[in-house]
Interface confidence: medium
């Protein structure tokens, strides 16, 4: 009885097809597989970026695999052949492991790339980010940024760019057409007269750095002598109803601070007879149900129902900004 | 609109130390990011440090381990500590503030080095 043995897939490669972190990892299917014709190999791809305490581990009869990493860092991985019990008499077997590691050669000192980077989703609809000049650069120094995500073709680089000092220090993204739910990718790297600039890579989904705009159209009902409902409407734009979380404050004469999170458009709050002025103010955030995380809107206009008697239906409506 | 003006600059000995301090119109609580830039003769101006709101700095290679940046939110100040001062130090240094997507740099103070 010989033992059985299978190599290693070859020519294990990852390849870095210009997406900004988006690499490929292939291989070919291992020498001497003749036999094993009647069987169908498998494969097990173990990957990470360095420095991660885990690999993702994939188990696969393909040839190729592809998956985001940060390019900030170095990336390795391995992968073995696998032959399932029914090709080897009943005990799968493992090939060695095939290895390769993947990094971009940085150019220039750590301090040089950008900091405190900002990404921001405009109520679902604009997209800007922004970010401070890197240490011990010159004001020569410029910034680039380019981006990509699935169903783009090749990277983009930023047309629009906000700049401070004659640098660039931000973009403004165009339309970006069914670009949520899946990995964004950008770069930022930088040119200067005198001393290269290191690349700064990240990543995120843009669902959730969205600021939606603020709640509109507050009003007031009077629904019993002791309850009054607040409603308001939700801003102009893409997002539906569905998404919204939202947070209210509301002050009795000017001394009770009352905050609630609802999520409906609609707040019932149990009044005194005594009260003599409501005002409330509300803001929106995207909530976990279109959304992993937010960022939340500014306030709402604040809203306020004045009178005598807040159980006789006067109502004064003062729009002016909450601070 | 952010006003900016540095002092403590002067003449000093290879080897000596200066404090500079760079004092601002309005309040600086809200404003995430400052820094010291400087430009030597007939050279660009370049960041040397920062320091956001949480207190966390960055030093440009050249001045790591020599200066040290601070700031006092209650007193409206950034500040920039220069030990061990070189004659390559010798620059018009300014002062740095970034709320937002502007940008604010005052009108700058003399450091000479120089036995």
């Known amino acids: 009885d010989t033992e059985i043995k299978v190599n290693p897939p070859q020519d294990f490669e990852i390849v870095d097809p210009g997406y900004l972190g988006y690499l490929y990892l292939q291989w070919q299917p291992p020498l001497s597989l003749d036999h094993f014709k009647e069987c169908t190999v498998e494969y097990e791809l173990k990957y990470r970026n360095i420095g991660s305490e885990t690999w993702k581990t994939i188990i696969t009869k393909n040839l190729h695999y592809k998956d985001g990493f940060d390019l900030n860092k170095g990336i390795e991985a391995k992968i073995h052949t696998l032959l399932p019990w029914q090709c080897t008499n009943g005990s799968e077997v493992q090939s060695s492991w095939a290895e390769t590691t993947y990094w971009i050669s940085p150019q220039g000192i750590p301090e040089t790339k950008v900091q405190d980077m900002d990404c921001v989703y405009y109520n679902w609809q604009y997209l800007l980010c922004s970010w401070k000049p890197g240490i011990g650069v010159l004001l020569d120094t410029n910034y680039n940024l380019f981006y990509w995500y699935e169903g783009l073709d090749h990277a983009l680089q930023c047309v629009d760019y906000i700049k401070a000092d004659g640098q660039n220090i931000g973009c403004r993204f165009p339309y970006l057409e069914a670009s949520d739910y899946k990995d964004f990718y950008i770069c930022v790297n930088g040119s200067s007269e005198n001393k290269p600039i290191r690349s700064s890579y990240f990543t995120f989904q843009l669902q959730n750095i969205v600021k939606p705009l603020p709640p509109v159209y507050l009003t007031f009902t009077r629904e019993s002598s002791c309850e009054i409902k607040l409603k308001w409407s939700i801003p102009l734009g893409p997002i539906p109803a569905r998404c919204f979380d939202y947070e209210i404050e509301i002050r009795e004469d000017d001394t009770t601070l009352v905050t609630a999170t609802v999520e409906n458009e609609t707040y019932t709050l149990k009044t005194t007879n005594e009260t003599r002025q409501l005002c409330f103010v509300v803001r929106s955030k995207v909530n976990i149900y279109c959304s992993d995380d937010g960022i939340w809107s500014e306030w709402s206009d604040k809203q306020c129902w004045e009178g005598e008697d807040l159980s006789k239906k006067t109502l004064l409506r003062h729009h002016h900004h909450h601070h | 609109q952010v006003q900016l003006q540095e002092s403590g600059g002067g003449l000093v000995q290879p080897g000596g130390s200066l404090r500079l301090s760079c004092t601002a119109s309005?309040?600086?609580?809200?404003?995430?990011?400052m820094a010291w830039g400087r430009q030597g003769p007939g050279k660009p101006r370049e960041l040397i440090a920062t320091i956001n709101s949480a207190g966390d700095t960055n030093y440009a290679e050249s001045v790591k381990g020599r200066f040290t940046v601070s700031r006092d939110n209650a007193e409206n100040t950034l500040y920039l500590q220069m030990n061990n001062l070189k004659s390559e130090d010798t620059a018009v240094y300014y002062c740095?503030?970034?709320?937002?997507?502007?940008?604010?740099w005052g009108q700058g103070t003399q450091v000479t080095v120089s036995s």
């Open positions: 740095n503030a970034r709320p937002g997507l502007q940008s604010y």
């Open positions: 309005g309040s600086i609580r809200g404003i995430g990011y």
